[in-house]
Structure formats: C-alpha cells, structure tokens
Interface confidence: low
C-alpha cells in the first residue's frame, strides 16, 4: 500500500535551516507529484509547494519563495523539503503528500505522518 | 491567493443525525475545460489528513457513502448523511485550481 514516511522531529534556532525527508513506497515514485504542506499551532493548513520527481519541476507558494527548496532523490524514492532562515512562526508540523491525476481529476491523496519542526532560541 | 472560507468553524453533532459543512472560495475554482479541483479532508486527532472527496463530489475509495460533496463555482458543501462517532475531527476543504493551493480554516466536528 502507499506509504509516505517522514524524518523525525527537529528543534532549530532562529536563522538556521531544516531539511525534512519523505520516503515513498508502494507506488511508482516518479509518477506522482509530491506536495509539502504545513500546519502551525492553531492555524489552517498551508501549502508550501510541489515537485515532480520525474523531472524535478517545482512550484512554490510565493510566501516561501527563496526560503524553501524542494528536491528528490529518485534512487531512494525520497523527497526533501529544506526551509532556511527559520523564524519562530515556522514552528509547525510539516507534511509531505502525494498528488496525482485520476482520470481528469486531481487530488492530494496520501499524506506522511508529519514532522514537527520547532524553532526556538 | 484564493481565500477559502469554511463555516461553521465548530459543529456539535448527534450520532445518526446529518451534518453539513460549507466552503466558499474568493474566486471561481472551475478550470477552463470544466474541471474543479476542490477536495475535502478529515484530520482525526493525532493523525494526518485523509482524503474524503475530490473533484467536488467524487468519493475517494474506501470512504463510506454517508459522505458526499456538491457545489460549483465558488460554493461547495460536504454532507454527512448520518454522523458516526468515528467521524469526529477537523474537516478541511482544499482548492487545487489556482496556485498557491489554499485550505479552508477547518471545521471541528464533535459529538454533542
């Protein structure tokens, strides 16, 4: 079955960077876009961006442009999200989630378990 | 960015009774060729969001048929025909028509 397994929780200082990994299994990794979404305490879910593993094409939420980098390692079926210049408001649970076309419909279907990133001095 | 507004934000329900959640977008979510990328997710306590409905009204496989989606343009609704105890959690709508994709603020469904 489709599974997305993320790396463990991270505690970072303001100004530092964090890199979260997401390993996909149970499906053809290169056939589906990988999305990244975060959820800060008491906030709505927020879409960060997406990457096409087959060609490494990316689309980013402008809010994160310049601070976030999405990459993949196809050989390891793993996607990465790196967020730099961290600030306290980046404290959130970060999710990877698979997206794909089903016939003519598109949806983000399966989600990772989430990675808590805490930014604190 | 497209703003997604859900209502109500809190929904106390009685098991066996119907429930309805509304989601309104600040602009039309219909693509030029007719598709509308509007989906609904349920996030149960301590879990990741799970897909319920995609393309406005298509139930994701394994989702009970008590869940249904409807709407068009800017107004969308998720209905639960008979709420069960396992349905509690926070429900989110998501638009995937315009980038950046945006979520509603969530509707917390809890048993009365």
């Amino acid at each position: 079955q489709v599974q997305l397994v993320q790396s463990g929780a991270e505690v970072k200082k303001p100004g530092a960077s964090v890199k979260v990994s997401c390993k996909g299994s149970g499906y053809t990794f290169t056939s589906y876009w990988m999305h990244w979404v975060r959820q800060a305490p008491g906030q709505r879910l927020e879409w960060i961006g997406e990457i096409d593993p087959s060609e490494s094409n990316t689309n980013y939420n402008q809010k994160f442009k310049g601070r976030v980098t999405l990459t993949v390692d196809i050989s390891a079926s793993t996607a990465y999200m790196e967020l730099s210049s961290l600030r306290s408001e980046d404290t959130a649970v970060y999710y990877c989630a698979r997206g794909g076309y089903d016939g003519w419909d598109y949806a983000i279907d399966y989600w990772g378990q989430g990675t808590l990133v805490t930014v604190s001095s | 960015d497209v703003v997604m507004t859900q209502s109500p934000l809190s929904l106390p329900v009685t098991p066996g009774e119907p429930a309805s959640i509304s989601c309104r977008s600040s602009q039309s979510l219909a693509k030029s060729y007719g598709n509308t990328y509007l989906s609904w997710y349920l996030q149960k306590p301590g879990q990741s969001p799970q897909l319920l409905i995609y393309g406005i009204s298509n139930r994701f496989s394994g989702v009970p048929d008590r869940f249904s989606g409807s709407g068009s343009g800017t107004d969308f609704t998720l209905k639960i025909s008979r709420v069960e105890a396992e349905d509690v959690g926070v429900y989110y709508c998501l638009q995937g028509t315009h980038q950046p994709y945006t979520f509603g603020q969530g509707t917390k469904v809890e048993i009365k």
């Epitope: 053809t28 056939s31 794909g100 076309y101 089903d102 016939g103 949806a107 | 496989s61």
Partner: antibody
Amino acid sequence: EVKLVESGGGLVQPGGSLKLSCAASGFTFSDYGMAWVRQAPRKGPEWVGFISNLAYSIYYADTVTGRFTISRENAKNTLYLEMSSLRSEDTAMYYCAREDGTTGESAMDYWGQGTSVTVSS
Amino acid sequence: DVQITQSPSYLAASPGETITINCRASKSISKYLAWYQEKPGKTNKLLIYSGSTLQSGIPSRFSGSGSGTDFTLTISSLEPEDFAMYYCQQHYEYPYTFGSGTKLEMK
C-alpha cells in the same frame, strides 16, 4: 506493445473464493483506468467493474457488488479481482481491459486473452 | 441500467460487400458507444469509440455513426479477416452495458 495477461482462474465450488490477476505491460499502468469484463458461455460480455488509475474510484456491476473486490498495485503493474461467495452464474471467461480515458471519452481499448472461472460442485 | 439492443444477431455476407450492424440504447447515451470485434483465440479489439471515432490502427472500411439512442457500425468492402463476432457497448455511464452480439459469417 500493450499486453494484458490474466491469471488465477480455475474450478471453484459454490460459495468459494478466487483471486484473479492481470499483469500489464507496454504502457504506463498508473495512467489508465482498468476494467474487468466477463463473458459466460454463449452469452454477450458483461461489465464487472472499473478501477480508476489511482484507485480513487471503483465501480461494480450490481450482480457482483459486495462479493467482488477490484484493486490494483501500480508499483507492480497489476490489476486484481477478488471474488467471494461465488455462484454458478459467475462461471465465465474473465477479461481485464484497459480503459483509455486520456481523451475524456473512455473506451476499453486493449483486452487480455481472458482466464476461465468455473463455479461448480 | 442502460439496455442495449443489437441487431441482427446473425449476418451472412460475401467479401467485397458492405454490411451494417445496429445498436439501440434504452435511453440517450449521447455519442458514447463503442464497437468491438471478437475472434476466437484473439483478444477483443476496439474498433470505434464515441460513436464514430476510429481507433488508431483500424482500417477505414470500418465506420460508426449515430447519437442519442441509435447507432450503426458499417463495414464496407468486407475482407476475409472481418468475419467475426461484433459487440457494441455504451460507455456513457456505469455500469457499462453491451449488446448481445452479431455474428458475421461468410456466405
């Protein structure tokens, strides 16, 4: 070239179970919806059910609803039909077929050679 | 369910002739009707979909027409390899349903 090869058919008693497989090759399996169609001796074909490319949507004929389960493993390029509570009227040749939905006008464009299922005591 | 009535159930013709097979749906299915050819020992072959669209690789002597409830498959200048079983199928809504078949035999 597109190839669909069914397997798993055989003789089973009424009330018994059987799992059919369909191995696909020659195309990107995860891009296509797949269907099962059966044909009883001296009868026309009967559509059994359909599973969309990412398995978001699964549909069944009324005659098999609750007894048959369609699934797919895109990572293995394989389609399945799990049949339980089998009846004599389920005796048929079972075909898997690719549904070409790329035009938005779906038709079953490639079929397998079929696998025979006989339900008899 | 949409009922599909196919006629005739049997047809004898000679190579070079033109034949037609008809299918009628119990309600409007727009243009969404497909035609298949079935031969012993071979996999079913899609000939026509969406009423009149020729599947790639299918000879142009095969043509489809019709919309709504009434559809026709025409094979002009029959070739020896065209003698086979033909089925129509609606792909307008689930459950997909088939006609009962037309057996085309050589005179």
